[in-house]
């Protein structure tokens, strides 16, 4: 369906934060867009977070979401927080043009996010 571009690889910060841009090529003049981040592990796909926004307005995730984001035109800047090493995996950006019709859907190829847990600080003797 729609073309959706996202980076192939992102390294999370030592604080467990990963950011990437999801860009889509809109075939029409959508006013309502839904962005979903999916995590794929083998044949399992789980929804990480999702937000619907009106073009020109800010992207709003639920209060308890681990995602935040901003939008500019056909670009969405996504940030995922609270990541740990076990969360390393393929994160897929899904974009849906919800309104007005026609409905369009696009799936990115996925961003491999690598998360390395920080080493615990050794005890210090002074």
């Amino acid at each position: 369906a729609m073309h959706v571009a996202q980076p192939a690889v992102v390294l999370a910060s030592s604080r467990g934060i990963a950011s990437f841009v999801c860009e889509y090529a809109s075939p029409g003049k959508a006013t309502e867009v839904r962005v979903t981040v999916l995590r794929q592990a083998d044949s399992q796909v789980t929804e990480v977070c999702a937000a619907t926004y009106m073009m020109g307005n800010e992207l709003t995730f639920l209060d308890d979401s681990i995602c935040t984001g901003t939008s500019s035109g056909n670009q969405v800047n996504l940030t995922i927080q609270g990541l740990r090493a076990m969360d390393t995996g393929l994160y897929i950006c899904k974009v849906e043009l919800m309104y007005p019709p026609p409905y369009y859907l696009g799936i990115g190829n996925g961003t491999q996010i690598y998360v390395i847990d920080p080493e615990p600080c050794p005890d210090s003797d002074f």
Epitope: S26, P27, V45, K94, Y103, Y104, G106, I107
Partner: antibody, heavy 115, light 108 residues
């Protein structure tokens, strides 16, 4: 009111050609990827092909069963999409629907391929 | 190409029954699935888009669910006007945008 009106169907002999037209109104034609879907008598729906719009360079896609024989084109200035069908086979006999996105459907036009 | 398998191929249920139709994809399609209703002698009509979204004007007794490879269309309380054939369709690129084989729903 959204309308898609197909025309050009009829009886044609195997090996011959036919061109179907679909005239759209009531929506922004140029924003839509247009599809052709067919339904053989007593059978299910079969996706035939698609033409995308200007932002997607009018890319076309076809099902394996019609690839190389059928061609989809569009005229955004007239809000018309065409299905050029060459080298027709008896198994192409069906009702042909055009769709806007997959949201809007025409009433269909019948193509019968028979000698 | 991704194959779409719909089941059952036909069913008969009573008015007021809950009816469930399933559609399976041979690969993950990330919710890129539509459901259509086709009444006898009529053109198909979009019911559900993107696996879960109800199309305009469609009664709320229809709902869609599923993700990954397995999807479901549910009619919570079957009505006489729901007699039709229902089709799922994969709408994920690259095409073909394959349809399932259809499920014919009749009233007992």
């Amino acid at each position: 009111e959204v309308q898609l009106v197909e025309s050009g169907g009829g009886l044609v002999q195997p090996g011959r050609s036919l061109r179907l037209s679909c005239t759209a109104s009531g929506f922004t034609f140029s924003d839509n990827w247009m599809n052709w879907v067919r339904q053989a008598p007593g059978k299910g729906l079969e996706w035939v092909g698609q033409i995308r719009n200007k932002p997607y360079n009018y890319e076309t896609y076809y099902s394996d069963s019609v690839k190389g024989r059928f061609t989809i084109s569009r005229d955004d200035s007239k809000s018309i999409v065409y299905l050029q069908m060459n080298s027709l086979k008896t198994e192409d006999t069906a009702v042909y629907y055009c769709t806007g996105g997959m949201d809007y459907w025409g009433q269909g036009t019948t193509v019968t391929v028979s000698s | 190409d991704i194959q779409m398998t719909q089941s059952p191929s036909s069913l008969s249920a009573s008015v007021g029954d809950r009816v469930t139709i399933t559609c399976g994809a041979s690969e993950i399609i990330y919710g890129a699935l539509n459901w259509y209703q086709q009444k006898p002698g009529k053109s198909p009509k979009l019911l559900i888009y993107g696996a879960t979204n109800l199309a305009d004007g469609v009664p709320s007794r229809f709902s869609g669910s599923g993700s990954g490879t397995d999807f479901t269309l549910t009619i919570s309380s079957l009505q006489p006007e729901d007699v039709a054939t229902y089709y799922c369709q994969k709408i994920l690129s690259p095409p073909p945008w394959t349809f399932g084989g259809g499920t014919k729903v009749e009233i007992k």
